[in-house]
Interface confidence: medium
């Protein structure tokens, strides 16, 4: 729960950046072009780098906690490394001209400092005991109190990044992750299904048998109809799944060579918004004690949208939050999914948790009967799959969305790419289905506008 992490998930990124040789924007002007640097570094043995002015000299890299002050004057001579000043660090051996600035924990987000910044390690931030982290975006989390499940039982205990999942006792229903008495259940709310017997009794026992029986008969009649509908849908899905195996699995690979020369438009990252020009309230929040944060989370069928992948407008946005869209897709339909997904290997495109359009397009186009296999291949455990199904109740597609969002949240940005999904689908012999995902995301102009995402 209150376990430690580096604020904004910086540490793994920093390590990666230092190893690969990509540097934060503040240092970008001080280092050579990435491609050149990679070529140059590969000439020298590990732990050394090529002298920027003399490519016949390999200089020793600086240890973590230090930075490059001056390159080595000649072969076998020492590199001039200086220790990072207070408030800065380097977490691995490097040849950075400046140390990286220490991160600060976000007090207004309820974060607490687990360990201070040292010259060789960034600040580690986390939450207090009995709190969990809710990620509003990939690198910004807020601490919330874990639900206590009063008038219910803990189905799944609170975890570092996940609130407690409660199951309510009889006579109580779940509202905003708390068990509320059925006496607070209004007819219009979703709780009527869970509190049906109590609601009927409230009418008064003097009512004749028909007033009690009639709603029950209607209810069970509707249940039977639902089961019948589900049965039909299941049969349809089985048929659809077989069709997918035949059509999706086989057709595209046979055509692989057909469009080899075709160039494709890569996904364009959505430009960040600048702060509002009109009004800017005083910068930052006033620190609010972390105990003031409480979360609630309800999953009701009413919240299930029409899941046709939404067509994008200007700059669509979770967050993850978990939970928010960050990638604007190229508007041209792309003819050959295989090539596009393979091309993305050169420059992997991040798939954002916050991009419902992308995730729902995947949900829509992976055959339902092969969904669990798909998410297992992405690394989700059966326990997680069951939990997300349970959490999302009767809304299967929302559960599937949550599974993808969970995968996205915990997969490093560089790895959670369209290319990876493509690889998994190819391993499942479902590569052709990518074409449908493409169409859903950037598809033909003829597609009708998507319905509203909510009710």
């Amino acid at each position: 729960m209150g376990l430690s992490t580096v604020p904004d998930l910086l540490l793994p990124l920093v390590l990666l950046e230092l190893l690969v040789g990509i540097y934060p924007s503040g240092v970008i002007g001080l280092v050579p072009h990435l491609g050149d640097r990679e070529k140059r570094d590969s000439v020298c043995p590990q732990g050394k780098y090529i002298h920027p002015q003399n490519n016949s000299i390999c200089c020793t890299k600086c240890h973590k906690g230090t930075y490059l002050y001056n390159d080595c004057p000649g072969p076998g001579q020492d590199t001039d490394c200086r220790e990072c000043e207070s408030g800065s660090f380097t977490a691995s051996e490097n040849h950075l001209r400046h140390c990286l600035s220490c991160s600060k924990c976000r007090k207004e987000m309820g974060q607490v400092e687990i360990s201070s910044c040292t010259v060789d390690r960034d600040t580690v931030c986390g939450c207090r005991k009995n709190q969990y982290r809710h990620y509003w975006s990939e690198n910004l989390f807020q601490c919330f109190n874990c639900s206590l499940c009063l008038n219910g039982t803990v189905h799944l205990s609170c975890q570092e990044k996940q609130n407690t999942v409660c199951t309510c006792h009889a006579g109580f229903f779940l509202r905003e992750n708390e068990c509320v008495s059925c006496s607070n259940c209004k007819k219009s709310l979703e709780c009527t299904k869970l509190c049906l017997p109590q609601i009927e009794n409230v009418k008064g026992t003097e009512d004749s048998g028909t007033t009690v029986l009639l709603p029950l008969v209607i209810f069970f009649g509707l249940c039977l109809l639902s089961l019948l509908f589900i049965g039909l849908m299941y049969r349809y899905q089985r048929w659809k799944s077989k069709l997918y195996s035949i059509v999706c699995g086989k057709s595209t690979p046979e055509k692989e060579g057909e469009l080899e020369g075709t160039t494709t438009k890569p996904l364009a990252p959505n430009p960040s918004f600048s702060p509002t020009p009109g009004f800017t309230p005083t910068l930052g929040f006033s620190p609010v004690p972390s105990s003031t944060f409480t979360s609630s989370s309800t999953y009701t069928p009413g919240d299930c949208p029409n899941f046709a992948a939404p067509r994008r407008e200007v700059a669509p946005p979770y967050q993850g939050a978990d939970p928010i869209l960050a990638t604007a897709l190229a508007s041209d339909p792309i003819p050959n999914p295989l090539q596009k997904w393979e091309d993305s290997a050169h420059k992997p495109q991040s798939l954002d948790t916050d991009d419902p359009a992308t995730l729902y397009a995947v949900v829509e186009n992976v055959p339902p009967l092969r969904w669990k296999e798909f998410v297992r291949r992405l690394g989700l455990s059966d326990h997680e799959i069951d939990r997300l199904e349970l959490q999302n109740g009767r809304c299967l597609r929302e559960a599937q969305y949550s599974m993808l969002a969970t995968w996205r949240r915990r997969t490093p940005r560089r790895e959670a790419t369209l290319e990876l999904l493509g690889r998994v689908l190819r391993d499942m012999d479902l590569l052709g289905c990518l074409e449908d995902i493409e169409e859903a995301l950037c598809g033909p102009a003829a597609l009708p506008p998507a319905p509203s995402l909510l009710r």
């Epitope: 904004d8 987000m109 509003w136 975006s137 990939e138 690198n139 910004l140 807020q142 905003e176 990252p269 959505n270 960040s272 918004f273 702060p275 509002t276 930052g284 929040f285 979360s295 609630s296 989370s297 309800t298 999953y299 009701t300 919240d303 949208p305 939404p310 994008r312 407008e313 200007v314 700059a315 669509p316 946005p317 979770y318 967050q319 993850g320 939050a321 939970p323 928010i324 869209l325 960050a326 954002d352 948790t353 916050d354 419902p356 359009a357 929302e398 509203s452 995402l453 909510l454």
Partner: nanobody, 122 residues
Amino acid sequence: EVQLLESGGGLVQPGGSLRLSCAASGFTFATYNMGWVRQAPGKGLEWVSSIAWLGSETYYADSVKGRFTISRDNSKNTLYLQMNSLRAEDTAVYYCAKHCKAECTGDLFDYWGQGTLVTVSS
């Protein structure tokens, strides 16, 4: 251009209720998390509540939990804050705000409205 316009503020007695609305335009409202933040006179900003883009997840500060309810109508591009059992300490300018997306590393919100004043006084 992103625009957020709050309304519904005013003077109310302790224990009373108010419903704030926020009309959004200039972005795809249905796909963004939204929230409310307030600033009491002479104090800093305080996060009040947030709602996920689908409306299925809601988050509240403890100081307002059980009294305030955040909701949204994506078909109307509108965010709401129902405030019940209001107290004197709820007096503040209430800002509707659009949550920052994953590429933002700084603040929780990237766009704010002009704010609407809520005064709780007898």
